[in-house]
Structure formats: C-alpha cells, structure tokens
C-alpha cells in the first residue's frame, strides 16, 4: 500500500498508558510492540494521532475496561473516536457503549471501534471514554491506530 | 494494494474449527467463504498464519463464545492475538476480555481484535483463549485473518 | 492503495438510519461524516453496499443495541454480515452474538464485525440483525463500510 517515495506507507499503532490526568481523553505511548511508520503520522502530547497527508484512513481503537453496575453511574461506559481538523469543529466519528457488569469487584469488557474516514492534512484523531479510571492497561488490552489506504 | 508481480496482494481469512486438543490455541481451517490470496501467507498446522514477506500487516480476529458465570472460573474469558517470530520473543499483540454472562445455560458474547503490526519473514500469528471449549463455531461466529498494507 | 486511474481507491463508510420497515436488514445513509470514494462502490436502496470491481475487500460493521433480558426473546442479539452475488446463493460472512443485558429499561452493548473477502463484480453486502428496533442510531454508534485492498 502506498509504495515508493511518492506514496510511503502510513500507519500507526500505539499502546495505552495510565494517566493521573482527570481528562476523559485516553493517553497513549510508543512502547511495547508499537508501530509508527514514519513522520507522516505522529503521536502528539500522548493523546492524539496526527496525519500530515490528506486521504482515506482506516482508523481503529480498542478499549478494555473493568466496571461494576453498583459502583458506576447509571449511564453505560462509552468509548468515542473523535476527529479534530484545523479550523473545523471537533466531531465524533465512532462510538461504542457497554452497560456495566454486575460482577464484583468489577467485570471486564472490551470494545472495538473501526472505520474508514477522510482526513485533512493536520487532522488529529483521539479517543474519549466516560471513565478513564476503569480502563485496563495490561499488555494488549487497550490500543489505538490507523492506516492510510 | 501491493499491485503487480513485485507487490502482490497478501491477505488471509480463515474459519474456526472445533478441536479435541486441550491446547488454548484456537484451530482454523480453509473452509467456507475463506480467503488465502497466495503462498505468501499460509495456514500452518491449522493454528497459525505465517507470512513470507516483511512488512506492515493489519491483523484481526473475532471470537464468539458462550459461558456462564457459575460454571466458569472467576477469571474473565480472554482472547489473545500472539506473535511468534524466528529467533525472537513470542509476545501478546492484542487482548480482549469479557466477564462471563449470568444467562443460563450460557450467554453468548463476541470479541473483536485488530491492529497494525510489523511482521518479519517467517513470523506467525495465532489466537489463544482461556477456554476453547466455550468458543462458538457456527457459521461466521469465529474467524481470523490479516492483510498486508 | 489502488493508486492511479487504473487502480482508484475504493472505500465506503455509511451511517445507520432508523427505519419503520419490519425487515431485519439494517438501513444506512450517506449522511454525517460518511465516505463514498467514487461510483465503484454504491449504497443501494439504503440497505446494501454494492461493488463494481472484483477483488479482495476488508468489510466491517458496527452495531450498538439496547436490550433487556426480560423484554427480549431467549435468543441472543445477533448481527450478521451477509453477501449477495449475482447468480449465487446469499451467504453469511460474519456473525456476532451478545446475550441481552439485565439492566433496565435496557442495557447498551456494541458489536464489531470485520474480515477480508473476495467480492465479484456486482456483489452486495448487507447487515442483518435479530431485532432492528433495539439498534442505537445516535451519532457514531452504528455504521457499515468496506475498503478494497
């Protein structure tokens, strides 16, 4: 895909990182078995994947979380894949929702999001969750990536 | 993607197969509506997809299982996508976890894993689960595949 | 991917649409942040993605639904990705199943399906669910797409 100097491969896969920040935006790191094909895609501030070239991208995220119905709010756990483009409104690209488990102390569940979207130069994608403290950061459980078609 | 003789398409999609083996590694078959683009990717011993060319691959697996909280161990059902490369450490690429259902006799749930990874020539990927006897093998429920970027 | 006039990119991502129809086939629309690369892939009758060119495609669907164990049938909620090719039998490519939640009035859950399949010219793919009335149509919750390798 995208062979040659004119058309290099563009792909990224980053790994979740626990964060003391109270923000709902998940944090990521280039660690473990990560992928960062070249500088045409970058991880910025540990929170968003930013692309330099316009085009169609398959973007995905996986979030594993552990929650309990009694200890959580009534609302389900929601993971959102969001887009921020220069000079445009932020928007939700994809969302997934899972009702909290009745298992104690908490029940693990995994969410997978993925889709094809047009990104502009300088566009960034990031992942929001309703409660970051419930996210599982064990090897392989929570990750985020993209590939340019 | 990978057009021409120099750059053939490389892709595979294989279908789950019930197994009497006690191993936690899932078994697969080239049956039903499967995909095997050419001999640059092969299904070995019915358990792993092995690639001949180095490069970035999008690798995915879907596992549907049926389990019951009372009849299962306390630990959740976990599906792991694992990598084995000649002369390198085996490692977990992706994992997903789902707590067992309280439905009787068992409750079905589906897990989807997917991500972009660099594979070396001769590298193999395979899928591990905590309890293979709980996996659903009905048409389309459990599958495994990859595509070279 | 598929660069140049001979080999244009082919990709689609469509958004779920609530429907008064009683059919189990989900309805989709080119609305919101949708993708339709060109006329080599089309959304027909709001229900199926149809391709003009033979080849390998990565096809995916995500379905979020809200259901309750007591109010639903015993059977789980099942989402199926199906294929219809000219002059051939329809067939199931992928399925996922989730047991209904015990949460009241209903518990949300998300399903993700995806795989690589060979499509013939004129082939159509569509998504079936056991109960369309349970599907969530909020922004980003339910979508369907493909990309040609």
């Amino acid at each position: 895909m995208q062979k040659g100097d004119q058309n290099p491969q563009i792909a990224a896969h980053v790994i979740s990182e626990a964060s003391s920040k109270t923000t709902s935006v998940l944090q990521w790191a280039e660690k473990g078995y990560y992928t960062m094909s070249n500088n045409l895609v970058t991880l910025e501030n540990g929170k968003q994947l930013t692309v330099k070239r316009q085009g169609l991208y398959y973007i995905y995220a996986q979030v594993t979380f552990c929650s309990n119905r009694e200890a959580s709010s009534q609302a389900p756990f929601i993971a959102s894949l969001c887009l921020k483009s220069p000079g445009r409104f932020e928007r939700i690209l994809l969302r997934a929702a899972n009702t909290h488990s009745s298992a104690k102390p908490c029940g693990q569940q995994s969410i997978h999001l993925g889709g094809v979207f047009e990104l502009q130069p300088g566009a960034s994608v990031f992942v929001n969750v309703t409660d970051p403290s419930q996210v599982s950061h064990g090897t392989g459980f929570t990750s985020f990536g993209l590939l340019k078609l | 993607m990978q057009k021409g003789d120099q750059n053939p398409q490389i892709a595979a999609h294989v279908i789950s197969e019930a197994s009497s083996k006690t191993t936690s590694v899932l078994q697969w078959a080239e049956k039903g509506y499967y995909t095997m683009s050419n001999n640059l990717v092969t299904l070995e011993n019915g358990k792993q997809l092995t690639v001949k060319r180095q490069g970035l691959y999008y690798i995915y697996a879907q596992v549907t299982f049926c389990s019951n909280r009372e009849a299962s161990s306390q630990a959740p059902f976990i599906a792991s996508l694992c990598l084995k490369s000649p002369g390198r450490f085996e490692r977990i690429l992706l994992r997903a976890a789902n707590t067992h259902s309280s439905a009787k006799p068992c409750g079905q749930q589906s897990i989807h894993l997917g991500g972009v990874f660099e594979l070396q020539p001769g590298a193999s990927v395979f899928v591990n689960v905590t309890d293979p006897s709980q996996v659903s093998h009905g048409t389309g429920f459990t599958s495994f595949g990859l595509l070279k970027l | 991917m598929q660069k140049g006039d001979q080999n244009p990119q082919i990709a689609a991502h469509v958004i779920s649409e609530a429907s008064s129809k009683t059919t189990s086939v989900l309805q989709w629309a080119e609305k919101g942040y949708y993708t339709m690369s060109n006329n080599l892939v089309t959304l027909e009758n709001g229900k199926q993605l149809t391709v003009k060119r033979q080849g390998l495609y990565y096809i995916y669907a995500q379905v979020t639904f809200c259901s309750n164990r007591e109010a639903s049938s015993q059977a789980p909620f099942i989402a199926s990705l199906c294929l219809k090719s000219p002059g051939r039998f329809e067939r199931i490519l992928l399925r996922a199943a989730n047991t209904h939640s015990s949460a009241k009035p209903c518990g949300q859950q998300s399903i993700h399906l995806g795989g690589v399949f060979e499509l013939q010219p004129g082939a159509s793919v569509f998504v079936n669910v056991t109960d369309p009335s349970q599907v969530s149509h909020g922004t980003g919750f339910t979508s369907f797409g493909l990309l040609k390798l």
């Epitope: 790994i15 660690k31 473990g32 950061h137 064990g138 090897t139 | 002369g87 390198r88 450490f89 490692r91 977990i92 660099e118 | -």
Partner: nanobody
Amino acid sequence: EVQLVESGGGLVQPGGSLRLSCAASGFGFGSYDMGWFRQAPGKEREFVAAIYSDGGSAYYADSVKGRFTISADNSKNTAYLQMNSLKPEDTAVYYCASDHYDTDTKSDVYNWGQGTLVTVSS
C-alpha cells in the same frame, strides 16, 4: 557494551527444579525486554519465556506454561527462570536474551548470552 551471563544450569532428576539467572550489564535493564530460549541437541533454538518492559508482563511457550516462571529484579539487573516439574524433554542449552527496539533503525536488537546447559535425567 551489552553483556548477558547465565548461571544455574546443571543435572537434575525428572520432577526436580532449577533456577537459572541472567546477569545483565551495559544497558538500561528496566527498559529492555528479557527472556529465555533453549536449544536441544540437533534441534532449532526455541522460545521459552519473556518478561516485557511495558509493565512487567510475562509470556510463556505452551510447552512450559504452568511449570516455568520468569521474573526480573531491576535493582540487581538480573532475570531469572524458575523451572519446576522438569522433564527429560527440557534438556537443552538455555540462552538468556535481551530485546530492545532501536528507534533509529526501527528494528528489534537482540543480544544473547553464551548459554547454560540443563540436563534432566535419572
């Protein structure tokens, strides 16, 4: 310069235990993945176990799962392989290895010890 020195091998009866050590020097131990391979006479070198720097998670080959335990002591720059319920088929030269991802070359760099022989026989 990266150096890995194994110790702890020897002769043990079936069902017995051994603990292998791998003393590392010349690199930031905590930021490298550490692991063990083995090579039986006339066979290819095979993976046994690894412990990863991203949170210390361990991974085992199916053949040793439940019997072997890998661990690391960052303060001593040493990795260990505790081998229990040993079988004759565990007889091999055991090699310690380190794996570090080189961000410049975008590739894994492996370093190897000289190996220590484990013989399981009655």
